[in-house]
């Protein structure tokens, strides 16, 4: 039950996180005009990964796409790439995790396969979250660097009568959305990985074996076995009751070498 809850919660948290990463990537407010030097401007500037916008006090907003690839800063391209990789990995992770959910039955899928898929999706979510956090952090670092550079420029060479106030940019809402979304995806991924451990069918201490003796039906339970070497450690025990006897484990699922990863 706890495993199902952990897996389900991990999926939901990751889903919210990836939706947030997509939203952040599409948002225009990655950087917004810093109004410290000109708080009374009638024109407000903000920029995203794909276009820059100008909002006038009148309510009119004008956006222009970056219709060039080669002319854009390498850092911006890197951030775009990180965010897209994050989205793609997250989307694949979501697809995989849907089939891995314990509450969803698809044919005769074994628990071992579900465990593997849960782990795979968990790792994908972790990498997706890290990509988003890295992308947003790179952009934030770029903003901080440019902010202080333009501040330095602002206070040099102002001896003339004409002031040319350089537009400075500060953190936009998309950065915070990206950080939170990346964090959620990461947490969701970790939860999936934790759920994977619980999903992997461990061998129990007591093997329940039933066999038929002539005249009586007796349930015989050999005790005292501790699986010390993983799967296959009790094969001798199983072979004793070959004549029609089955362990409870054999009835439910067949152990596989993939169960522990």
């Amino acid at each position: 039950m706890a495993v199902t809850a952990c897996q389900g919660l991990g999926f939901v948290v990751s889903l919210i996180g990836i939706a947030g990463i997509i939203a952040a990537t599409c948002m225009d407010q990655w950087s917004t005009q810093d109004l410290y030097n000109n708080p009374v401007t009638a024109v407000f500037n903000y920029q995203g990964l794909w276009r820059s916008c100008v909002r006038e006090s009148s309510g009119f907003t004008e956006c222009r796409g970056y219709f060039t690839l080669l002319g854009l800063p390498a850092m911006l391209q890197a951030v775009r790439a990180l965010m897209i990789v994050g989205i793609v990995l997250g989307a694949i992770g979501l697809l995989v995790s849907i089939f891995a959910l314990k509450c969803i039955r698809i044919g005769s899928m074994e628990d071992s396969a579900k465990a593997n898929m849960t782990l795979t999706s968990g790792i994908m979510f972790i990498v997706s979250g890290l990509c988003a956090i890295a992308g947003v952090s790179v952009f934030a670092n770029m903003l901080v660097t440019n902010f202080w550079m333009s501040t330095a420029n602002m206070y040099t060479g102002m001896g003339g009568m004409v002031q040319t106030v350089q537009t400075r940019y500060t953190f936009g809402a998309a950065l915070f959305v990206g950080w939170v979304a990346g964090g959620l995806t990461l947490i969701g991924g970790v939860m999936m990985c934790i759920a994977c451990r619980g999903l992997a069918p461990e061998e129990t201490n007591y093997k329940a074996v039933s066999y038929h003796a002539s005249g009586h039906s007796v349930a015989y339970k050999p005790g005292g076995f501790k699986a010390s070497t993983g799967f296959g450690s009790n094969t001798k025990n199983k072979k004793i009751y070959d004549g029609g006897a089955r362990t409870e484990d054999e009835v439910q699922s067949y152990p596989s070498k993939h169960d522990y990863v």
Partner: antibody, heavy 116, light 113 residues
């Protein structure tokens, strides 16, 4: 067509307050902002303030303490209220429609004289 | 506040001549985000309210004759009347609409000989 018409008291005693109404037609106040501009006799134009479609306002800092702009969208009216008038507030007061921060349509103006 | 300085303060010219007046702002009116200069030119004829001529420094308002041309960027702007006509007798104002308060220049009074 677009029209703006100012109506005011004409004469105001010093230290009294001034109220001017700008009645608009041909456009909606929920879509356009309205500016207030004044012009003392024989002098240049002075921007007073603006009220935007959402109801938010911006004022000339020099007059901010005694200036108030409001509106009634349903009546298509914009109101200018100015307190503590002095003789140098004597001017022609205009309201004008905003279009992308420029003023494309102006009213004929209302003359305000501050005198005892 | 942005200070708008217009020159000359008055100008006496003959009909048919080319007229140029300038407007300087104490701060750049160029918005880097959309490459627009938030400067507007108005014409005010005697006894009338001002009339919008040019916005964004160079975009002519519809209905304005093409003899009126606005140019310039940043802090230096020019209004040119290519062939002056008698009806152009007016005061011309430039206005900053980039930063509050929206300040006007003191105007250039155009008189015809």
């Amino acid at each position: 067509q677009v029209q703006l018409k100012e109506s005011g008291p004409g004469l105001v005693a010093p230290s009294q307050s001034l109220s001017i109404t700008c009645t608009v037609s041909g456009f909606s106040l929920t879509s356009y902002g309205v500016h207030w501009v004044r012009q003392p006799p024989g002098k240049g134009l002075e921007w007073l303030g603006v009220i935007w479609p959402g109801g938010n306002t911006n004022y000339n800092i020099a007059l901010m303490s005694r200036l108030s702009i409001s509106k009634d969208n349903s009546k298509s009216q914009v109101f200018l209220k100015m307190n503590s008038l002095q003789t140098d507030d004597t001017a022609m007061y205009y309201c004008a429609r905003d279009r992308r921060l420029a003023m494309d349509y102006w009213g004929q103006g209302t003359s305000v004289t501050v005198s005892s | 506040d942005i200070v708008m300085t217009q020159s000359p303060s008055s100008l006496t010219v003959t009909a048919g001549e080319k007229v140029t007046m300038t407007c300087k702002s104490s701060q750049s009116l160029l918005e880097s985000g959309n490459q627009k200069n938030y400067l507007t030119w108005y014409q005010q004829k005697p006894g009338q309210p001002p009339k919008l001529l040019i916005y964004w420094a160079s975009t002519r308002e519809s209905g304005v004759p093409d003899r009126f041309t606005g140019s310039g960027s940043g802090t230096d702007f020019t209004l040119t009347i290519s062939i002056l006509q008698a009806e152009d007798l007016a005061v011309y104002y430039c206005q900053n609409d980039y930063s509050y308060p929206f300040t006007f220049g003191s105007g250039t009074k155009l008189e015809i000989k």
